[in-house]
């Protein structure tokens, strides 16, 4: 697998923290971006197409022209990470206006109208519109694709041959935005849970607005939140168990910045599922629980997770973190009774969480089963 | 010493199929890369794409996609370049190479070279 | 796609030094090779790794690549180096590989 997320965090742990090269440490500060370089060029074969790599080896040429390093000489040896002192150079705080959306794009209006968007589990998707659908979109797939943001995510199967999938890799691309940050590019694996841009950075680059885009994290390797405020946005990335979940709330205005609707306009987030990727699992789970213990292979795409799971465990399980009855508990239910991995009940409590932190409207945080959903656009 | 034999000169028909082989012999042909290269009459290399011998995985320039497909047979150490619906500016001489490394620099370079194939596409 | 571009045709005196450049975009921070290709043969590599020659090479084949531009120099040119020159790189991303547009080099 392509292994340049390992890459990222050796030059960040050789560049950052209290031995870390200082600015005008030119020669100590080539020597790490050699073996970045370097490591870089040892993973290639197998980043081919790879977002993250792409924007890694471009900013490596880019760095190196800017402190005129030559490819030849020493390499670094990575050092063990360390937290950046106080008062690190990337905390600046005076952003132009225009590098903060309520400021600048709302001078003259109410407060914008914020939307939310969440992944998680098998996967369940909730759309910007509060759509709930559970989908298997394996391989990888556009979650937001606007004129400012870019997010890619890649399912896989949970069992082998299940159709049911879950989120192993995410991409996320800040596009470059005046003069408030340069292009940015987040990426996260199982296991593999960044607290910085794969360039290593924590924050929107060198421009004047840098700090209006920045990442924090919050558990170390399992929950980091990303605060892009030039576009009002907020994104929650965690780790639950093997998996990945993600969380946007994000203005309407920029949800909706679309050029190419025919195009763009197909993303998970706006449009959910394709009909041909969705999974009625709300059909499954009241088949499920008319039949008790009894698995339902035929009710579900994936395979049946083991005997030892049976119905009524799932929903004990459940209901100890989601007590109210809501799609996320039934997420949970089925997320359990398809791959019996207990991980899904935190899933899926993580994703409620999420959504009463980001979701604008506190009377929509629970969703609850109606008549079918329109689908989203094949 | 360090060989790759190529079979001899084609001539085909415009919509034609052509397979070029290359016999590798003097080192172990899983170890490294094989990769194909093609400079019609006058003109300058051109690279097609590689093959890795251990796997069968490929990797094949944009514009040859769909028409090229590289294979290979580890028991005769020969890999193998098809080239389908030829056309009379495919015709050109067809190199199979060594990719040689330097696996602590992760550097790469071409060395040796095949012989060379001459494909000619004519009606 | 990744470009490298070189004169179609350098021309020198028997004796002198022949320089041959190869540009493209940050070229110096790529490891470029160059390829010699007399009539009727297969090229045969000169130099790799921006500057370091194979055993067989004579001496007076040297290279350096720095900022955009890769130059290979045969310094003591002689007539039996009158061949076309390619200069190469590997690009990283697509994990293709990029050739020269080549230069014929003539010995007057």
């Known amino acids: 697998p392509c292994k340049i997320l390992k890459c990222n965090s050796e030059f960040w742990s050789a560049t950052s923290g209290s031995h870390a090269p200082a600015s005008d440490d030119t020669p100590e500060f080539c020597a790490a971006l050699r073996s970045y370089a370097l490591c870089t060029r040892r993973t290639a074969r197998t980043c081919r197409g790879d977002l993250a790599y792409h924007s890694a080896v471009h900013g490596i040429e880019d760095l190196m022209s800017q402190h005129n390093c030559s490819k030849d000489g020493p390499t670094s040896q990575p050092r063990l990470r360390t937290l950046p002192p106080a008062g690190d150079s990337q905390e600046r705080s005076d952003s132009p206006e225009i590098c903060h959306y309520e400021k600048s794009f709302h001078k003259h209006s109410a407060t914008p109208n914020y939307t939310h968007c969440g992944l998680f589990g098998d996967p369940h998707l909730r759309t910007f519109t509060d759509r709930f659908q559970t989908c298997k979109v394996q391989g990888a797939w556009p979650l937001i694709d606007n004129n400012y943001l870019n997010v890619q995510v890649t399912n896989t199967p949970v069992l082998p041959g299940s159709a049911a999938t879950a989120t192993s890799k995410l991409t996320i691309i800040f596009k470059n935005f005046q003069e408030c940050v340069d292009q940015k590019v987040y990426q996260a694996e199982m296991d593999e849970l960044p607290a910085a841009f794969v360039d290593g950075s924590k924050n929107g680059g060198d421009k004047h607005g840098a700090n209006s885009l920045k990442i924090t994290e919050k558990v170390s390797g399992q929950h980091v939140e990303i605060q892009a405020k030039y576009i009002g946005t907020t994104i929650v990335v965690r780790q639950v168990g093997r998996y990945l979940t993600f969380a946007v709330r994000m203005p309407e205005e920029v949800v909706n910045a679309v050029e190419d609707w025919d195009s763009q306009g197909l993303y998970l987030c706006l449009r959910g599922c394709p009909l041909n990727q969705q999974i009625d699992f709300q059909a499954f789970h009241t088949n499920a629980e008319g039949t008790g213990a009894r698995r339902l292979a035929a009710a579900s795409p994936a395979p049946t997770a083991p005997e030892t799971f049976p119905y009524e465990t799932a929903v004990a399980k459940c209901k100890e973190k989601l007590p109210v009855e809501d799609l996320y508990y039934q997420a949970c239910v089925f997320d359990l009774l398809t791959t019996g991995d207990v991980n899904f009940t935190l899933a899926a409590y993580y994703a409620l969480e999420d959504v009463k932190m980001l979701h604008s409207n506190k009377d929509k945080l629970h969703l609850y089963e109606r008549t079918r959903d329109l689908p989203g656009r094949a | 010493e360090v060989q790759l034999v190529q079979s001899g000169a084609e001539v085909k028909e415009p919509g034609a199929s052509v397979k070029v082989s290359c016999k590798a012999s003097g080192y172990t042909f899983t170890d490294y890369y094989i990769q194909w290269v093609r400079q019609a009459p006058g003109h300058g290399l051109e690279w097609m794409g590689w093959i890795n011998p251990k796997t069968g995985g490929t990797n094949y320039l944009q514009k040859f996609q769909g028409r090229v497909t590289m294979t290979r047979d580890t028991s005769t150490r020969t890999a193998y370049m098809e080239l389908s619906s030829l056309r009379s500016d495919d015709t050109a001489f067809y190199y199979c190479?060594?990719?040689?490394?330097?696996?602590?620099?992760?550097?790469?370079?071409?060395?040796?070279w095949g012989q060379g194939t001459l494909v000619t596409v004519s009606s | 796609s990744y470009e490298l571009t070189q004169p179609p045709s350098v021309s020198v005196s028997p004796g002198q030094t022949a320089r041959i450049t190869c540009s493209g975009n940050?070229?110096?921070?790529?490891?470029a090779s160059w390829y010699q290709q007399k009539p009727g043969q297969s090229p045969v590599v000169v130099i790799y790794e921006d500057k370091k020659r194979p055993s067989g090479i004579p001496e007076r084949f040297s290279g350096s690549n720095s900022g955009n531009t890769a130059t290979l120099t045969i310094s003591g040119t002689q007539a039996m180096d009158e061949a076309d020159y390619y200069c190469q790189v590997w690009d990283v991303i697509t994990d293709h590989y990029v050739f020269g547009t080549g230069t014929k080099v003539t010995v007057l």
């Open positions: 190479v060594r990719e040689d490394m330097n696996t602590v620099l992760a550097t790469s370079w071409f060395d040796p």
């Open positions: 940050q070229l110096g921070h790529k490891f």
